[in-house]
């Protein structure tokens, strides 16, 4: 789903159930370290020299949402987070090269500690390049691999 | 093999209620989304909406949404579609309709369908 | 709501000829489309999702081509056991919508 242009609002299809409280991991972890801004998990990235990945979602797309129950149900991508700083955004940054190709969510990116957004690190479909879906938990999880694989820098 | 089994249709008059139950079997209940999809006599589609049975989550047509409720029993490997207020308009064949096999949305196989009728 | 729109809404065909079928979104939406065969007093089957691939069992004469706002459904060699109504859906965006359909009649 493409969220450059913004449909009309979709307050009639939100479900109204009570919920729990809403924690920072908005489902996609709840046993996993969240961080709630950009900023933070740029600087916690950095400190600790662990990978950011980040993910831009939505509560109210269809595939935001089917991606997150295998993500949460995955025990592997779920261990091998624990290797990252980790952030999910229900709102678009203002970074540029967070939608190099365009602001459809679900879509799935990494940071390297050095701070290089890792744009090098995509999924299979030529149109979305940062797009996955349930079915591409196995690359998915290569793809967090990779990026486990800190970039080297320079002294 | 994947089936889905719907029941509970009848005849129920207007402002009454009904529940529809969906029966699966042959996959895993709990990691594919469930979808309910209605068609008046001889007319086209409507989704209605869908549910994840692992947790409960539930997302609604806006049409349907302040009368019909969406729920799941892990223990049953069921679905169920409360219809509260029920008008004319909501005479229809109900179907249930599974996700792809991977928790993927898209309408992958289709119960036989139930009919309820509303009507004084 | 994001309305599909079919055409034709009926086509006579004599076995053997090819059938297509379009579908038009009113917004982009992507590959998320389905097309699914219903004849009468039977519920619908789903023959192709994701715009062009095919589901398992399905007879390779049906496929789907398109992406963003247009999509087609193709019957190569149109057999009697094709009659039938063929609905597109999109499922890119709440609520899911479906085309009105398009009645197949061979002739």
């Known amino acids: 789903r493409d969220t450059t242009v913004k449909p009309g609002a979709k307050k009639d299809t939100k479900d109204s159930r009570p919920k729990l409280p809403q924690t920072l991991s908005r489902g996609w972890g709840d046993q996993l370290i969240w961080t709630q801004t950009y900023e933070e998990a740029l600087y916690k990235s950095k400190t600790s020299n662990k990978p950011l990945m980040i993910i831009h979602h939505l509560d109210e797309c269809p595939h935001s949402q089917a991606l997150k129950k295998v993500f949460a149900e995955n025990k592997e991508i779920q261990k091998l987070a624990e290797q990252f700083v980790l952030l999910n955004l229900v709102y678009e940054t203002t970074d540029k090269h967070l939608s190099p190709d365009g602001q459809y969510v679900p879509r799935i990116m990494f940071v390297d500690p050095s701070l290089t957004v890792r744009a090098d690190i995509t999924g299979r479909y030529s149109n979305r390049l940062y797009a996955y879906e349930p079915a591409d938990t196995a690359l998915l999880l290569d793809n967090m691999k990779k990026a486990l694989k800190l970039l080297k820098t320079e002294l | 093999q994947v089936q889905l089994l719907e029941s509970g249709g009848g005849l129920v008059k207007p402002g009454g209620s009904l529940r529809l139950s969906c029966a699966t079997s042959?996959?895993?209940?709990?990691?594919?989304?469930m979808n309910w999809i209605r068609q008046a006599p001889g007319q086209g589609l409507e989704w209605i909406g869908w549910?994840?049975?692992?947790?409960?989550?539930?997302n609604y047509n806006g049409k349907v949404k302040d009368r019909f409720t969406l729920s799941a029993d892990k223990a049953k490997n069921s679905v169920y579609l409360q219809m509260n207020s029920l008008r004319a308009e909501d005479t229809a064949v109900y179907f249930c309709?599974?996700?792809?096999?991977?928790?993927?949305?898209?309408?992958?196989?289709w119960g036989q369908g139930t009919l309820v009728t509303v009507s004084s | 709501e994001i309305v599909l729109t079919q055409s034709p809404d009926f086509q006579s065909v004599t076995p053997k000829e090819k059938v297509t079928i379009t579908c038009k979104a009113s917004?982009?939406?992507?590959?998320?489309l389905s097309w699914f065969q219903q004849k009468p007093d039977q519920s619908p089957k789903t023959l192709i999702y994701?715009?062009?691939r095919l589901v398992d069992g399905v007879p390779s004469r049906f496929s789907g081509s398109g992406s963003g706002q247009d999509f087609t459904l193709t019957i190569n060699s149109l057999e009697a056991e094709d009659a039938a109504t063929y609905y597109c859906?999109?499922?890119?965006?709440?609520?899911?919508?479906f085309g009105g359909g398009t009645k197949v009649e061979i002739k």
């Open positions: 309709a599974r996700g792809g096999y991977d928790g993927s949305p898209w309408l992958s196989y």
């Open positions: 042959g996959y895993v209940f709990s990691r594919s989304w």
């Open positions: 549910i994840y049975p692992g947790d409960g989550d539930t």
């Open positions: 917004q982009d939406i992507n590959s998320y």
């Open positions: 994701r715009a062009n």
């Open positions: 859906l999109q499922y890119d965006e709440f609520p899911f919508t």
